[in-house]
């Protein structure tokens, strides 16, 4: 199809080489309530284009995205050629940053309901650049946490070094929905609820003498509880003795509950005590068996191929630790009688 009639938007993505970062493009097709409509491109130059309100935002789930190769080749369907780019309804998600994402992206509705070739499309010229060292040292992260039940804020990473007074007007989106009243470089959240978790996008316009473009940043916001004040507790084993059969295989499970920590480095390991000696056992990897907002339950097993007489004299100790402290639970094996 002919893309010469597409409306054009220029965007800049300045990514940090230090952090994982995502990016999004919205298919900003004209809506009936907007002043710019799509017009039929089959009219002769002397005819006045017949303005057609295109489609409401509710219809935008069925759009097609293409990339325009720089060498002038035909348009490429995004879904077929770019595994690191995902289409979700009318939004294009870039999962990894890189200058190779620079280029022209075109979106248009899949179904053209008019008998004419309707030039109803948007061309987005995306420029992707790594952030220079000269940029602000303490720019806001692309991953921000909000503490449930408290007051918090979401900062636009590309503007976080500017004061509110010198900041340009910002356009914010939450999960693709325009937040029309939020216009500053920082959104104040009076009281944080689960509702506030999501993908936020902040846009502002930058101009030079020649042209203007939209600078965009994406912020993943997570709602969290406060860091735990407790050391982990061991849920299993509960008993300090365990009846076993000699010569049989045995698995002892250690399950521990760790309270939420923003920087989470849980330790769960088994070691063996035999008279004055003690040593750590190499056991299978720990696995998370339940994770909630407040805590996580992690399990790690010790496996004995067969229980020996020597094992009855040893103590098997599960050791768990977080930043607050550690807890241990020891198990003595006891031979099952008759």
């Amino acid at each position: 199809f002919n893309i010469s009639g597409c409306s054009t938007k220029k965007l800049l993505w300045t990514y940090s080489t230090r952090s994982e970062e995502e990016f999004v493009l919205f298919c900003d097709l004209p809506e009936p309530q907007k002043s710019h409509f799509c017009h039929r491109n089959r009219l002769s130059p002397k005819q006045v284009p017949e303005h057609l309100p295109f489609m409401g935002s509710n219809d935008l789930s069925d759009v097609q995205w293409y990339q325009q190769p720089s060498n002038g080749d035909p348009l490429e369907d995004i879904r077929k050629s770019y595994p690191h780019i995902i289409q979700d309804k009318c939004t294009l998600h870039f999962l990894t940053p890189g200058v190779n994402n620079s280029g022209s992206y075109i979106c248009r509705p899949k179904m053209i309901k008019s008998p004419y070739d309707v030039a109803c499309c948007v061309k987005m010229i995306l420029e992707v650049k790594p952030q220079t060292n000269a940029s602000c040292e303490y720019s806001a992260s692309h991953k921000q946490d909000l503490l449930l039940g408290s007051t918090g804020s979401i900062s636009c990473p590309s503007l976080s070094c500017q004061s509110d007074a010198q900041s340009p007007a910002v356009t914010w989106y939450k999960n693709g929905k325009l937040l029309s009243v939020e216009r500053s470089n920082r959104i104040v959240v009076d009281e944080v609820y689960d509702y506030h978790q999501g993908t936020y996008v902040c846009d502002y316009t930058q101009s030079d003498t020649v042209s203007s473009w939209t600078v965009r940043a994406v912020v993943q916001v997570r709602t969290i509880v406060g860091d735990t004040k407790l050391k982990p507790d061991i849920l299993d084993p509960v008993e300090d003795t365990l009846e076993v059969e000699l010569g049989k295989p045995l698995t002892i499970s250690c399950k521990a509950r760790f309270g939420f920590e923003r920087v989470f480095n849980p330790v769960i390991k088994w070691y063996i005590k035999d008279s004055d000696l003690e040593w750590e056992v190499s056991v299978p990897e720990a696995k998370s068996i339940k994770s909630t907002l407040k805590d996580e339950i992690i399990e790690r097993n010790i496996i004995l191929e067969k229980v020996t007489q020597r094992d009855l004299r040893r103590k098997f100790v599960c050791f768990v630790q977080n930043s607050i402290g550690n807890t241990t639970q020891s198990v003595q094996l006891k031979e099952k009688r008759g």
């Epitope: 929905k177 937040l179 009281e191 509702y195």
Partner: antibody, heavy 118, light 111 residues
Framework: SLEESGGDLVKPGASLTLTCTAS?????????MCWVRQAPGKGLEWIAC????????TYYASWAKGRFTISKTSSTTVTLQMTSLTAADTATYFC????????????WGPGTLVTVSS | DVVMTQTPASVSAAVGGTVTIKCQAS??????LAWYQQKPGQPPKLLIY???TLASGVPSRFKGSGSGTQFTLTISDLECADAATYYC?????????????FGGGTEVVVK
């Protein structure tokens, strides 16, 4: 409960401050304290809200910005300062409490009447 | 600011009948909408919040529905006591749950 006070008959161009006093609870996080007005025989019109928690954020209807100021003056009182009053500001002014993540008004005062007339 | 448009301005129905009031938001407000009932000389009373959740003590004859920009309040099995003016209200402002713009109101007359 909530009770408004300060309603009066004033001349055009005058200023007036209304006070909302809470009984049985004090303003805290999770509460928005707000002002709503209703001109005689007309509908409800939102004026402004203030968050009672630490951010102290204020929110105004676009028509109210600049002429109306909402403030939390204590843990149980909120005021609405009104300047350059005109006859169009004649209304019953209600104080209302918005709570939690539902954002609705679950508690209202009985209202106080402001009349602007020469 | 979001603009709330309520229709009709007035509606009349017989006791035992049903009335439907519509409310349209100028932008997507998800399900952050409340409905109030107001009788002359009284402050409004909350009926429904979050578009469809009945406030405490409100009879189940009152039903709220909708999300995004289109909302409806339906009152069935009308009683004389339902004669009042009904208002919708947007209850989200940006990302904060701030009660704000009201619809123009609908007067319900019960015959």
């Amino acid at each position: 409960s909530l009770e408004e006070s300060g309603g009066d008959l004033v001349k055009p161009g005058a200023s007036l401050t209304l006070t909302c006093t809470a009984s049985g609870f004090s303003f805290s996080s999770s509460y928005y304290m707000c002002w709503v007005r209703q001109a005689p025989g007309k509908g409800l019109e939102w004026i402004a809200c203030i968050y009672a928690g630490s951010s102290g954020s204020t929110y105004y209807a676009s028509w109210a910005k600049g002429r109306f100021t909402i403030s939390k003056t204590s843990s149980t009182t909120v005021t609405l300062q009104m300047t350059s009053l005109t006859a169009a500001d004649t209304a019953t002014y209600f104080c209302a409490r918005g709570a939690g993540s539902n954002g609705d008004f679950n508690l209202w005062g009985p209202g106080t009447l402001v009349t602007v007339s020469s | 600011d979001v603009v709330m448009t309520q229709t009709p301005a007035s509606v009349s129905a017989a006791v035992g009948g049903t009335v439907t009031i519509k409310c349209q938001a100028s932008e997507d407000i998800e399900s952050y909408l409340a409905w109030y009932q107001q009788k002359p000389g009284q402050p409004p009373k909350l009926l429904i919040y979050r578009a469809s959740t009945l406030a405490s003590g409100v009879p189940s004859r009152f039903k709220g529905s909708g999300s995004g920009t289109q909302f409806t309040l339906t009152i069935s099995d009308l009683e004389c006591a339902d004669a009042a003016t009904y208002y919708c209200q947007c209850t989200i402002y940006g990302v904060n749950f701030v009660p704000n713009a009201f619809g123009g109101g609908t007067e319900v007359v019960v015959k």
